[in-house]
């Protein structure tokens, strides 16, 4: 029998200071742009190479950002989100959520990767 | 398998124009924030121009402004660069180059880029 996987979902606030090349991340997602299926969240597409987002080294490609300096972007279209973030000002607080893939062994069976365990 | 494959670069005489069509397997297209680079014998591989996911914001080196466009074709994973008044300077290998999303920390920097395509000659003589 297959395991299954599961999902450990955690959330963080990540303080970060923009660097000369920006906040030094990409980002998809919003009404206009679900990169989830029916999720129109702002998720990381990517991280800059030595940018801020790398050297703080917590925000992780795939994460979904749930608010910058407190600002909700739920229900955002994609550019409202964008400049959202390039105004964000120097110092920018992220709330971010990792989801992080547990592979969880057969069914009855607990793995070592539950996260139950 | 991620695959930009250029198209449509040529001799053409100064004053001409050349049309350029990268065309896009392998990602979700319409997530990406496409661009075209160029580089001359010798030289770095410079920026030309970019355009966002939606190809409702374009930006272009000052070098090309006015006579070059950027556009993208979503439906048919395609994005082009029309060449117009071309001169012997635009001389060089031009490549298509693509990364996943909107960049919050610039969109000029080759490093900006994870896609790259073989490239395609543009040769203008005077």
């Known amino acids: 029998m297959n395991g299954r996987v599961d999902y450990l979902v955690t959330e963080e606030e990540i303080n970060l200071t923009r660097g000369p090349s920006g906040l030094g991340f990409n980002i998809v997602g919003g009404t206009d742009q679900q990169y989830v299926s029916n999720d129109s969240g702002i998720y990381v597409s990517r991280i800059k190479e030595n940018g801020a987002a790398a050297l703080d080294g917590r925000l992780q490609e795939g994460d979904k950002i749930l608010s910058v300096n407190g600002q909700d972007l739920k229900n955002l279209l994609h550019q409202d989100a964008v400049d959202l973030f390039r105004n964000a000002g120097y110092a920018v607080s992220l709330r971010v959520q990792h989801r992080l893939q547990v592979q969880n062994g057969p069914i009855g069976h607990r793995g070592e990767g539950d996260p139950s365990g | 398998d991620v695959q930009l494959v250029e198209s449509g670069g040529g001799l053409v005489q100064a004053g001409d124009s050349l049309r350029l069509s990268c065309a896009a397997s392998?990602?979700?297209?319409?997530?990406?924030?496409m661009a075209w680079f160029r580089q001359a014998p010798g030289k770095e591989r410079d920026f030309v121009a970019t355009?966002?996911?939606?190809?409702?914001?374009?930006n272009y080196a000052d070098s090309v402004k006015g006579r070059f466009t950027i556009s993208r074709d979503n439906a048919k994973n395609t994005v082009t660069l029309q060449m117009n008044s071309l001169q012997p300077e635009d001389t060089a290998v031009y490549y298509c180059a693509g990364v996943p999303g909107t960049s919050l920390s610039g969109e000029t920097d080759p490093r900006d880029y994870d896609y790259w395509g073989q490239g395609t000659q543009v040769t203008v003589s005077s």
């Open positions: 392998g990602i979700t297209f319409r997530w990406y924030t």
């Open positions: 355009i966002n996911w939606s190809g409702s914001d374009t």
